[in-house]
């Protein structure tokens, strides 16, 4: 039976059982400060003209963007401004062949974060340059509160506690 | 626990809802799924509303059957029911951790005549 | 879409003996499979999920095997208690979008 098409954010380790995983911790921060949401300056790399992109020095290209795999682990807000100091962003998935593309680069099991998570005050899951999930195009299973942000594994999407520490990937 | 009311005696397409009332579940963390049994007949998955409130339907339901929530109940709506949709309509939590999808905790059912 | 094939429909055993149930997927699902077991006027109870992780509870007669489209429960040592119809239930999920499906069912009945 179809459910629906698109990328699954599957729950986060535990089961849903406990009617409370974690407590809301009030708004995310980085720097000190509310996330922003990206802005379009932020997003310097246009899509198209794949063939105009000159991607920096370890950082892959793929319809038009570049893509950064860290080695190294951080929590999600972590993750997110050691991107946009970059002048990048955590990785937003557009499609399906966006994905392949990911997982064939990643070559590990565990999770990695990239730039999704539920905003408190718009109360949806919501991609780091501001717009919302498409639920017809994105299943997202786990956690819909504060202090849930996003990683993915093996072509899926999990829900995880911002906090934890992992792998991320940065995108311009 | 999960306990699901609403079952009745309906006439062919008058709209029915079914509601399942939750208890010590945090339907912010848990999808719920709605399955039917006709009876005598085998187990039929109807639709999931998951956390976020977005709702996702068996390709047979879609058009025929609405889920919706509050922070504590969990409603099914049967847009125009037919005689095929007789059967207990049970409410089900998913408690699958990580990669898995399971359902361990179901209602007792409540059952709908048309 | 993923289509769950369980055969038998239905099998009898005496006190004792061994039931053999099995479940065939479409397509390759992993390990994400569940069985479940329903009693009349009863809602279905979950006895095995990640094709062989035995839910909390549950007896150890019950056991789950298999991974793909290949799955096996096997009820060894049957009590009369273990009178019931079992059903599989598969997720395939991915990229590709997300299915759940039922098994037809199997009814134990117990001598």
């Known amino acids: 039976l179809l459910v629906s098409q698109g990328v699954l954010l599957k729950c986060q380790k535990g089961s849903c059982s406990n009617a409370t995983q974690y407590e809301d911790t009030g708004d995310l921060k980085v720097n000190n400060g509310t996330r922003r949401n990206i802005s379009n300056k932020d997003l310097c790399a246009s899509r198209s003209a794949d063939q105009t992109v000159l991607c920096q020095s370890e950082w892959l290209k793929y319809q038009g963007k570049c893509y950064w795999f860290s080695n190294e682990m951080k929590s999600w807000s972590d993750s997110y401004v050691y991107c946009l100091e970059r002048k990048s962003h955590l990785l937003i998935i557009h499609d399906q062949l966006e994905m392949a593309f990911i997982q064939k680069n990643l070559r590990q099991l565990n999770y990695v974060w990239i730039g999704l998570n539920f905003t408190s005050l718009k109360m949806t899951w919501t991609w780091v340059d501001g717009s919302p999930i498409d639920s017809k195009i994105f299943f997202i299973k786990g956690p819909a509160k504060e202090n849930s942000c996003a990683a993915i594994k093996e072509s899926k999407i999990f829900s995880e506690t911002c906090s934890s520490v992992f792998k991320w990937i940065c995108q311009y | 626990s999960v306990e699901e009311s609403g079952g009745r005696l309906v006439t062919p397409g008058t709209p029915l809802t079914l509601t399942c009332t939750v208890s010590?579940?945090?339907?912010?963390?848990?999808?719920m799924i709605w399955v039917r049994q006709a009876p005598g007949e085998g187990l039929e998955y109807i639709g999931l509303i998951n956390t976020d409130g977005s709702a996702y339907y068996a390709s047979w339901a879609k058009g025929r059957f609405t889920i919706s929530k509050t922070s504590t109940t969990v409603d099914l709506k049967i847009t125009s029911p037919t005689t095929e949709d007789t059967a207990t309509y049970f409410c089900?939590?998913?408690?699958?951790?990580?990669?898995?999808?399971?359902?361990?905790?179901w209602g007792q059912g409540t059952l709908v005549t048309v | 879409d993923v289509v769950m094939t369980q055969t038998p429909a239905s099998v009898s055993e005496p006190v004792g003996g061994t039931v053999t149930i099995k479940c065939q997927a479409s397509?390759?699902?992993?390990?994400?499979l569940a069985w479940y077991q329903q009693k009349p006027g009863q809602p279905p109870k979950l006895l095995i999920y990640?094709?062989?992780t035995l839910e909390s509870g549950v007896s150890s007669r019950f056991k789950g095997s298999g991974s793909g489209t290949e799955f096996t429960l096997t009820i060894s040592g049957v009590q009369c208690a273990d009178a019931a119809t079992y059903y599989c239930q598969c997720t395939d999920y991915g990229s590709s979008g997300l299915f759940f499906a039922f098994g037809g069912g199997t009814e134990v009945v117990v001598k």
């Open positions: 397509q390759s699902i992993g390990r994400n």
């Open positions: 990640s094709a062989s």
């Open positions: 089900v939590r998913d408690g699958g951790t990580d990669d898995h999808f399971y359902f361990n905790l």
């Open positions: 010590g579940i945090d339907l912010s963390s848990c999808a």
